[in-house]
């Protein structure tokens, strides 16, 4: 829906101002070369056309150069995330140049005015890059622009305007209002760098989407579906500070993109993987855990360059805090029904037992409904590395834990009043690990007892590496 900004939501940018009020904007943009991890240390200010500061501050022409670009600001000062990102970059890439693009005077405005300033700030960055390119040994290939929120679109403009092509742009939850559906040159886009990767953490289909919903890079990663981030609920926010407000929730979810990127820099031994999928619902069903044909990738700094003909939307689940990595599993459960049970919505839980650890009891999220006499696919994820899986406990929740479940039971009974013995049969569970891509088959511990009903459980042991069973032909519905 149209964003509620400005007349018709339209920017009064330079092309559309009456000629009389067009003025040459004196860009309030400063380039701060951070020479230390210490946020108190001021660093050096680079000045277009002045080579001395480059030498005095030890600018390394052959090293990687990061430009960090902040977004709209209500406070007018740098926020904490920026210092964390500077520090993480210095930790990971010791010789790199880390430049903070300070456009605070132009960003500390009404949102609409800050949006109008993105073009001129992008142009300033491009001019700085054009000047640096005149120096021996400086290569745009080594330039990585990292833009948060509105800063992601500034990075897009910079990549658009520069003479040549920058190596990489990372968009950290690019701003949505006034950019959703915008022309390819009026927002971050895959054309703006050799590789454009994007993290979307605050997208909403209903109401105002602070982050852009549409894909704008070569790869667009939507952690937790790109909307509700774990640890950012009102309860979490209320619990972690004296006062919790909707504003804090918004900040938590929007800023999560930055922290995921920081995590990828400092916890490189615990990389988070994302999986290509057409939409969030299919991912929630566990359909998309393939790594074939570049269908999975590390997120954040460690993302591998992918320049597909078409944009790639990728999904993953995360923990509520650093390290964000979780372990994804696809579970395929073939459900048999020997009785016509009508519409049935069981509440299943699984516990996974591995060589390193056992999982908590994990709910099997039913995205649509359980198909009877068919294979149902689920996504489960654990916060710890379980090692090699050994066995699985499957539980059908018994006595109703909620009014919703009570209603489900009543509805099920009303549709089948003469079938009180609700029962399903499950002979085996096929599991695929997203992180290792290993496939395993688990068979019912007691082959004579494969039935499960409310309040009961079934145990499955690993019976095979891979998914194909002996004497098994193409998958057909197996009935007794």
């Amino acid at each position: 829906s149209p964003t509620p900004f400005g007349p018709e939501g339209q920017l009064e940018d330079e092309l559309h101002k009456p000629k009389a009020i067009q003025t040459e904007v004196k860009p309030s943009v400063r380039f701060n070369l951070r020479t230390s991890k210490d946020p108190e240390h001021e660093g050096c200010y680079l000045s277009l056309g002045h080579s001395q500061p480059l030498e005095d501050c030890g600018f390394n022409m052959t090293a990687k150069t990061f430009f960090i670009i902040h977004g709209w600001t209500m406070s007018g000062i740098f926020e904490n995330w920026l210092h964390k990102l500077v520090s993480a970059l210095h930790t990971r890439e010791k010789d790199a140049n880390v430049v903070v693009v300070d456009w605070l005077p132009l960003a500390h405005q009404l949102y609409t005015d800050a949006v109008n300033n993105t073009r001129v700030v992008g142009h300033s960055i491009a001019r700085m890059l054009d000047w640096l390119q005149e120096k021996d040994d400086f290569s745009l290939e080594n330039v990585h622009l990292i833009g948060y929120s509105l800063g992601a679109h500034v990075a897009g403009y910079a990549g658009n305007f520069v003479k040549g092509t920058v190596g990489r742009i990372t968009g950290l939850d690019p701003a949505g209002p006034m950019f959703e559906g915008a022309d390819i040159h009026k927002r971050l886009s895959p054309d703006d760098a050799d590789f454009v990767d994007v993290l979307h953490t605050y997208t909403r289909s209903f109401g105002l989407s602070i982050g852009i919903q549409m894909p704008v890079g070569h790869i667009d990663i939507y952690p937790n579906g790109g909307d509700f981030q774990p640890g950012c609920g009102l309860n979490d926010v209320l619990g972690s500070m004296a006062y919790g407000t909707i504003t804090e929730v918004v900040k938590c979810e929007h800023e999560r993109a930055v922290h995921l990127f920081v995590d990828s820099l400092v916890n490189q031994d615990k990389p988070s993987f994302a999986f290509q999928c057409t939409d969030s619902n299919r991912f929630k069903k566990g359909i998309c855990l393939s790594c074939r044909k570049n269908r999975c990738n590390s997120i954040g700094y460690n993302a591998k360059k992918m320049r597909n003909k078409r944009n790639s939307k990728m999904y993953l689940k995360t923990r509520a805090g650093m390290p964000f990595r979780v372990y994804h599993y696809q579970m395929k459960i073939h459900v048999f029904s020997y009785k016509n049970m009508g519409e049935i919505e069981p509440t299943f839980y699984v516990t996974l037992y591995g060589t390193n650890a056992d999982s908590q009891t994990l709910p099997l999220e039913i995205v649509e409904r359980i198909e009877q006499n068919a294979t149902n696919t689920f996504l489960v994820y654990t916060e710890e590395d379980l090692g090699d899986l050994l066995k699985i406990q499957l539980t059908w929740e018994g006595a109703s834990q909620s009014w919703y479940n009570l209603w489900k039971e009543l509805r099920s009974y009303l549709s089948q009043p003469h079938n009180p013995g609700r029962e399903l049969n499950i002979r085996r569970i096929r599991v695929k690990s997203g992180e290792t891509q290993r496939k395993l088959t688990f068979c019912a511990e007691d082959p004579e007892n494969t039935s499960i009903s409310p309040g009961r459980e079934l145990w499955f042991r690993k019976c095979r590496d891979g998914w194909r069973m002996k004497n098994e032909t193409s998958p057909t519905v197996e009935l007794p």
């Epitope: 829906s1 149209p2 339209q10 940018d13 330079e14 092309l15 559309h16 000629k19 067009q22 073009r119 142009h123 491009a126 658009n160 305007f161 520069v162 003479k163 040549g164 959703e180 559906g181 915008a182 022309d183 390819i184 040159h185 009026k186 886009s189 895959p190 054309d191 919903q213 549409m214 894909p215 078409r310």
Partner: antibody, heavy 116, light 107 residues
Framework: QVQLVQSGAEVKKPGASVKVSCKAS????????IAWVRQAPGQGLEWMGE????????KYNKKFKGRVTMTRDTSTSTVYMELSSLRSEDTAVYYC?????????WGQGTTVTVSS | DIQMTQSPSSLSASVGDRVTITCKAS??????VAWYQQKPGKSPKLLIY???YRFTGVPSRFSGSGSGTDFTLTISSLQPEDFATYYC?????????FGGGTKVEIK
């Protein structure tokens, strides 16, 4: 106000080249993409490509790759579109348009007739 | 390349009528669609951008809607000056592609 003024009509023989100009005024010429769109008689609109005058970056429609060249002269705020190896089906009105929200402002069009 | 299919290719309507033109993209273009109006012998004019935003100076009787692959241009009450050809264009990715056009004629 923003204005795009194009060069006059051209008549060319098959195999020849044509160079159409588009002079921009009323805005900062270097920072907005200018596209070329053509329209054959009685037909729809066809995007040929575009140029960003500041950096001279170009994007071309694959259909015209190798035959079309877009250039600019920042001193006169003018962009040029040259189409080579002309054939009769290149007979069309050629428009330049400056892009921001969409193709916000258009030139008046240049008629190019290819005939032996 | 993304194909944009417009329908109908032509329609006859009277002054005061409500007119709806549709455009279908061959793949998801989200809300990155613009609509143009062109009168005979004239250059096209931008009406709608980002699927639903009216461009400067465009009368409120023109409205756009849609997202994903299906888009609509609506003229709520057709005026004599609205008889023209209308084009949709996707501006999600390069190459930019136009629909084939819809000619709105007087009944």
């Amino acid at each position: 106000q923003v204005q795009l003024v194009q060069s006059g009509a051209e008549v060319k023989k098959p195999g020849a080249s044509v160079k159409v100009s588009c002079k921009a005024s009323g805005y900062t010429f270097t920072t907005y993409w200018i596209a070329w769109v053509r329209q054959a008689p009685g037909q729809g609109l066809e995007w040929m490509g575009e140029i960003l005058p500041g950096s001279a970056k170009t994007k071309y429609n694959k259909k015209f790759k190798g035959r079309v060249t877009m250039t600019r002269d920042t001193s006169t705020s003018t962009v040029y579109m040259e189409l080579s190896s002309l054939r009769s089906e290149d007979t069309a009105v050629y428009y330049c348009a400056v892009y921001d929200y969409g193709a916000d402002y258009w030139g008046q069009g240049t008629t190019v007739t290819v005939s032996s | 390349d993304i194909q944009m299919t417009q329908s109908p290719s032509s329609l006859s309507a009277s002054v005061g009528d409500r007119v709806t033109i549709t455009c279908k993209a061959s793949q998801d273009v989200y809300t990155a669609v613009a609509w143009y109006q062109q009168k005979p012998g004239k250059s096209p004019k931008l009406l709608i951008y980002s699927a639903s935003y009216r461009f400067t100076g465009v009368p409120s009787r023109f409205s756009g809607s849609g997202s994903g692959t299906d888009f609509t241009l609506t003229i709520s009450s057709l005026q004599p000056e609205d008889f023209a050809t209308y084009y949709c264009q996707q501006h999600y990715s390069i190459p930019r592609t136009f629909g084939g056009g819809t000619k709105v004629e007087i009944k």
